[in-house]
């Protein structure tokens, strides 16, 4: 069964999928298509690299300039390094600027909403 | 003012190869895919593929697969379709499309010139 | 990969007369459907986007609809200068898909 067979099987039970699912999907070439992808949960989405996201959606990672001003995506993109988004060559913006240290201050990221940032 | 401008026009013999260039201004190169598609003589429009100019990652419409190469040079803001193995089947003239991303997966708002590409022995 | 099925092949219209072309998706595709207009030996024009919307500069002659699978694009009054192929694509997929194409003439 290759990759595509694989995840028309598994959709329908994906809106609940943890991040590890979603990392482990990533690397079979299922190439999730997008109203899927804006159904997984936001706190599965989050974690994931760029290059996860890309792998993830395959051909479908061009769906994600239309949506980045919704959640999940719009949330994900504030958690990326600019640098990381300007690689899927869609112009998304928002990320986290270059040169800035993210802190993983779970705490004040659950009452914020945000990661917290350090200047350079 | 958005600006695609492709390379001329070329006549190839059966089992070559063509590179078609498609010269990108007025706008930011790296933000938007391209995109090819093809139309043979009196027939309709024809998806080819596209590419990321950021990284240069295609993806190919799975009947070219075999035969398609794009690339890109972001230096010069270029973006090539090169067809290998060509065939008479393969006359056509390919046009290179930028996309908007208002929805979905985004139309294309702007088009090349058109390169026309005869095969013939 | 989604099929656009376009219709008719061609038709011939006297100048006035409304023109419809309809295009049918073999999956749904929500509203994604632009359509095109080319002339001999040029690249295609955007007209409509998003079943409906009119490209700026487009005459209000042109117009959309439908949803789903089923769409219809019109020309109200047809003109001399729309004499043209037209063309659907679907764009609800990353690997976009033309209609067949509708050339238009003048009776």
């Known amino acids: 069964m290759n990759g595509s067979e694989y995840f028309v099987k598994i959709q329908s039970f994906l809106g609940g999928a943890p991040t590890e699912d979603l990392k482990a999907l990533s690397q079979q070439n299922v190439s999730m298509d997008l109203a899927t992808f804006m159904k997984l949960r936001t706190d599965a989405v989050l974690p994931l690299t760029v290059a996860e996201v890309q792998k993830l959606l395959g051909p479908h990672v061009e769906g994600l300039k239309a949506e980045e001003r919704h959640r999940p995506v719009r949330d994900w993109i504030l958690r990326q390094r600019q640098d990381d988004l300007d690689t899927l060559g869609l112009g998304l913006q928002g990320g986290i600027p270059n040169g800035y240290l993210v802190l993983d201050l779970s705490m004040q990221e659950a009452l914020s909403g945000t990661p917290c940032l350090l200047g350079p | 003012e958005v600006q695609l401008v492709q390379s001329g026009a070329e006549v190839k013999k059966p089992g070559a190869s063509v590179k078609v260039s498609c010269k990108a201004s007025?706008?930011?190169?790296?933000?938007?895919?391209m995109h090819w598609v093809r139309q043979a003589p009196g027939q309709g429009l024809e998806w080819m593929g596209n590419?990321?100019?950021?990284?240069?990652?295609?993806y190919y419409n799975e009947r070219f697969r075999s035969r398609v190469t794009m690339t890109v040079d972001k230096s010069t803001s270029t973006a090539y379709m090169e067809l290998s193995s060509l065939r008479s089947e393969d006359t056509a003239v390919y046009y290179c499309?930028?996309?908007?991303?208002?929805?979905?997966?985004?139309?294309?708002?702007?088009w090349g010139q058109g390169t026309t590409v005869t095969v013939s022995s | 990969d989604i099929q656009m099925t376009q219709s008719p092949s061609s038709l011939s219209a006297s100048v006035g007369d409304r023109v419809t072309i309809t295009c049918k998706a073999s999956?749904?595709?929500?509203?994604?459907i632009a359509w095109y207009q080319q002339k001999p030996g040029k690249a295609p024009k955007l007209l409509i986007h998003?079943?409906?919307e009119l490209q700026p500069g487009v005459p209000s002659r042109f117009s959309g609809s439908g949803s789903g699978t089923d769409f219809t694009f019109t020309i109200s009054s047809l003109q001399p200068e729309d004499i043209a192929t037209y063309y659907c694509?679907?764009?609800?997929?990353?690997?976009?898909?033309f209609g067949g194409g509708t050339k238009v003439e003048i009776k």
């Open positions: 998003y079943t409906s």
């Open positions: 590419i990321n100019p950021s990284n240069g990652g295609p």
């Open positions: 999956q749904d595709i929500n509203k994604y």
């Open positions: 694509l679907q764009y609800a997929n990353p690997l976009r898909t």
């Open positions: 499309a930028r996309p908007y991303y208002g929805s979905s997966y985004g139309y294309f708002d702007y």
């Open positions: 007025g706008y930011t190169f790296t933000n938007y895919w």
